[in-house]
Interface confidence: medium
Amino acid sequence: WELTILHTNDVHSRLEQTSEDSSKCVNASRCMGGVARLFTKVQQIRRAEPNVLLLDAGDQYQGTIWFTVYKGAEVAHFMNALRYDAMALGNHEFDNGVEGLIEPLLKEAKFPILSANIKAKGPLASQISGLYLPYKVLPVGDEVVGIVGYTSKETPFLSNPGTNLVFEDEITALQPEVDKLKTLNVNKIIALGHSGFEMDKLIAQKVRGVDVVVGGHSNTFLYTGNPPSKEVPAGKYPFIVTSDDGRKVPVVQAYAFGKYLGYLKIEFDERGNVISSHGNPILLNSSIPEDPSIKADINKWRIKLDNYSTQELGKTIVYLDGSSQSCRFRECNMGNLICDAMINNNLRHTDEMFWNHVSMCILNGGGIRSPIDERNNGTITWENLAAVLPFGGTFDLVQLKGSTLKKAFEHSVHRYGQSTGEFLQVGGIHVVYDLSRKPGDRVVKLDVLCTKCRVPSYDPLKMDEVYKVILPNFLANGGDGFQMIKDELLRHDSGDQDINVVSTYISKMKVIYPAVEGRIKFSHHHHHH
């Protein structure tokens, strides 16, 4: 018996087609993805093949103005239109709290939404009961397939799930649910979830009875043969893991942003054992036409977005200096504003010993692309912020050793004075540079804001200590020469859309007046270029 699994993950509100790098589509003939194009391909496969499941491994939420405006209603609407068969909860599904998950998505979705390792307690238990499930048995042709869900147990640090949801260890939670499916005579079981490729592989290895793992969270691109676009494969598709009980378990993921549709064909014997598996992600490029009816629906929903982007979010009573002449040479107040917003967006009081789990932010000055003039009645709009942060990135959470941070700050000024983008803006960090010293030895003071304290204060960076830092995904991926971050990071979790972080902060503060306040200093008066 043959099953075709179509799968997406980490779509992050890319409902419209995008450019090849998943930012705003400029030249339509070269654009990719989007739900209209995805629907065309899904329908084509559904017509051609008998047993097809369309699955999503989480993180539909968060990533573009679509989510900012529609808050998840767009996810439910268009996933219903595409007739998804099941979805696993990702960490970003909790970005607007539990209410922001229940009302727009859980109550509106016409497909099961799954997670076996999230347990509700207290008053929430009855409120959310039945709205998401640990597993679902789906009829496919003449057979049944069990889908069991899982979600990153780090979600309380990455999003806003509140205090009434407990995130258990994935493997511990999955095993009893899979066992239950076996007692129900379900012998074909897919683990669908959102914990990253390393955990996907562990689930394949450790959870007895799981036949296939369909994952997300780490934006992993797998491919067999010559890849069709810019993404470099982390391994073959499917990635085969030998389980502890000797089975070959295919593990798949489909990169992110709806650029590819994962396509996996599995052959089962009559006892539900996997005999063979093969496939590849399908690049959703312009050779696949956009479905006209879905496209028309997208255009209808788009109207509200255009109106939103010119509305006032808040006011500034100071000039927001995002000029390259400032942000690539010295502390700039636009950099301070963005870093303050990044920290504010990551406030999670999950431990009495810590005022917050993270206190530090770094931001490449080259990522700040425009100032905002306060002489326009002080008005700040989404449109203004899109000029400051035009790349459609995310502000991510990483864990780094102090020694890596020191290298990053040395890189920040290794060729100071050439207006290059690697000069770092900061939050929760005080750095002093001496430019009279040789490159690689210019950081003379680096103090960081404590987290395990009731009164935050600055302490010298410790080389061997592990720190959490919020930074642009561009830096986490080694951009602007920050290879040491990519090479040495100990953990990396994708965060919220950059513009959304800043716009939420401005809306919350109502009036802003960021200052230049001595976060970055130069000894020997080397601060002029």
């Epitope: 020694s403 290298k407 040395e410 890189h411 490159p439 290879q483 040491m484 090479d487």
Partner: nanobody
Framework: QVQLQESGGGLVQAGGSLRLSCAAS????????MGWYRQAPGKLRDLVAK???????TYADSVKGRFTISGDNAKNTVYLQMNSLKPEDTAVYYC?????WGQGTQVTVSS
Amino acid sequence: QVQLQESGGGLVQAGGSLRLSCAASENIFNIYGMGWYRQAPGKLRDLVAKITSGGRTTYADSVKGRFTISGDNAKNTVYLQMNSLKPEDTAVYYCNSYYYWGQGTQVTVSS
């Protein structure tokens, strides 16, 4: 401007060994790590081995088990120990760190 200076190349018989060195004029190994690349006549420059500033190493499949990269942070120097050399290892070997490159050193392996 950072200078990288390679040394240690030369002519050697197949099966023999050479040790290449690359000295940096400034403290960049600590930040970026270093790598060795090679370029045979009419071919593209290929990665041979690299070492991150944290000491993690990567090797091209063709040299695994024969070549060893190591670094001395204090001296801003990286080494490439090449054993069991083959004629196909003949190339100009370049040292690299971030976007800085050395001038190259010729390695010729005769059969």
